[in-house]
């Protein structure tokens, strides 16, 4: 059960989807990818305050235990709940091929 | 592809399964759970250095971009890769029932 979407820390501070522009060089892909030359990387960034977008029961437990033992148990973390696929034109030993990656771009986010 | 399991930060410092003992009171469950009275909560704790247990391509991208833009892009985070189910004996309006939760205890961990 995804819990509340209201961010108590202020607009844009809590776990949400961000887009970061990255070149092949930034990603360390220049030696094996031809296209795209630049990727709009969607990723999950932001804080996970109590019960904000809690992914499941485990996330709720983590929130409770973090409140009790903050030095031992970390707060839940903002991670992808699902992904958007992306095609890469990549170099092979003999030339190029198209390869679709299902786990490259975050589609939406939750706290876990 | 789960990447290297060697922790460059020293034994036990990187993302792995930990067990934290918690009472029903700790978990905020005392008003709706009868048993167990104490839970051995398995959770994922630890650092995610470069390519350590990278869950997927997204995690690898995150590592690369964190290295470039540490103030903008956080490092990958240690989260459950899978879960162990657990049964709770819980209070109902009329008595008790058994309920199995599939997403309560972490089974193993990765970085994402």
């Amino acid at each position: 059960a995804r819990n509340g979407d209201h961010c108590p820390l202020g607009p844009g501070r809590c776990c949400r989807l961000h887009t970061v522009r990255a070149s092949l060089e930034d990603l360390g892909w220049a030696d094996w990818v031809l296209s795209p030359r630049e990727v709009q990387v969607t990723m999950c960034i932001g804080a996970c305050p109590s019960q904000f977008r809690a992914a499941n029961m485990h996330a709720q437990i983590k929130t409770s235990l973090h409140r009790l033992k903050p030095d031992t148990v970390p707060a839940p973390c903002c991670v992808p709940a699902s992904y958007n696929p992306m095609v890469l034109i990549q170099k092979t030993d003999t030339g190029v091929s198209l390869q679709t990656y299902d786990d490259l771009l975050a589609k939406d986010c939750h706290c876990i | 592809a789960r990447n290297g399991d060697h922790c460059p930060l020293g034994p036990g410092r990187c993302c792995r399964l930990h067990t934290v003992r918690a009472s029903l009171e700790d978990l905020g469950w005392a008003d709706w759970v009868l048993s167990p009275r104490e839970v051995q909560v398995t959770m994922c704790i630890g650092a995610c250095p470069s390519q350590f247990r990278a869950a997927n391509m997204h995690a690898q991208i995150k590592t690369s971009l964190h290295r470039l833009k540490p103030d903008t892009v956080p490092a990958p985070c240690c989260v459950p890769a899978s879960y162990n189910p657990m049964v709770l004996i819980q209070k109902t309006d009329t008595g008790v029932s058994l309920q199995t939760y599939d997403d309560l205890l972490a089974k193993d961990c990765h970085c994402i």
Partner: antibody, heavy 118, light 106 residues
């Protein structure tokens, strides 16, 4: 494997609107980087790009034909439509749709022949 | 728009010959050039991407080179199935094709 199949009326009268459909399988237009383009080939001549549509719904048209072209997609049906208005005999051609990966026409359909005649 | 000028427009060659087709862009297109093969009654088939990279499944006798404005497609040793029309294509700006080179049996 990737497959694209063009369908059209075969014969269209001058001044009418030509409607073409491309039905594809083996890839998804929800995938970042994917698109579908339309290219035509008049009898005995070379290839002319008409339009394409991308995963993010960005549409591009050949500037020389832009006022007459409309491209659209139905991702759920894996179909792309192209409409060409006010046709003349010069629009007689084989019309191809092609899978695009980052602006490259990687795989082409077999084509559908369209004749403009009264 | 960017014009792609292919030469020759047609050429005759024999099985085993080495053949080179050239394509000149009217302005710099970096390496954003592809090559296609089309046999009579068939649709075009991708051969080369990014000026010099063979598409998967394309025989190694096909090679591409060039950058900027001048590009070549070379077939190192012609096979009977290679007689076809070849097109260059730039995708640096909105797509344009060369007029084609028809390769015939001598």
């Amino acid at each position: 494997q990737v497959q694209l199949q063009e369908s059209g009326p075969g014969l269209v009268k001058p001044s009418e609107t030509l409607s073409l459909t491309c039905t594809f399988s083996g890839f998804s237009l929800s995938t970042s980087g994917m698109g579908v383009g339309w290219i035509r080939q008049p009898p005995g001549k070379g290839l002319e790009w008409l339009a394409h549509i991308r995963w993010d719904d960005v549409k591009r048209y050949n500037p020389a034909l832009k006022s007459r072209l409309t491209i659209s997609k139905d991702t759920s049906k894996s179909q792309i439509s192209l409409k060409l208005s006010s046709v003349t005999a010069a629009d007689t051609a084989v019309y191809y749709c092609a899978q695009m990966a980052w602006d490259w026409f990687a795989y082409w359909g077999q084509g559908t022949t369209v004749t403009v005649s009264s | 728009d960017i014009q792609m000028t292919q030469s020759p427009s047609s050429l005759s060659a024999s099985v085993g010959d080495r053949v080179t087709i050239t394509c000149k862009a009217s302005q710099n297109v970096d390496t954003d050039v592809a090559w296609y093969q089309q046999k009579p009654g068939q649709s075009p088939k991708a051969l080369i991407y990014s000026a010099s990279y063979r598409y998967s499944g394309v025989p190694s006798r096909f090679s591409g080179s060039g950058s900027g404005t001048d590009f070549t497609l070379t077939i190192s040793s012609l096979q009977p199935e290679d007689f076809a029309t070849y097109y260059c294509h730039q995708y640096n700006s909105y797509p344009t094709f060369g007029q084609g080179t028809r390769l015939e049996i001598k």
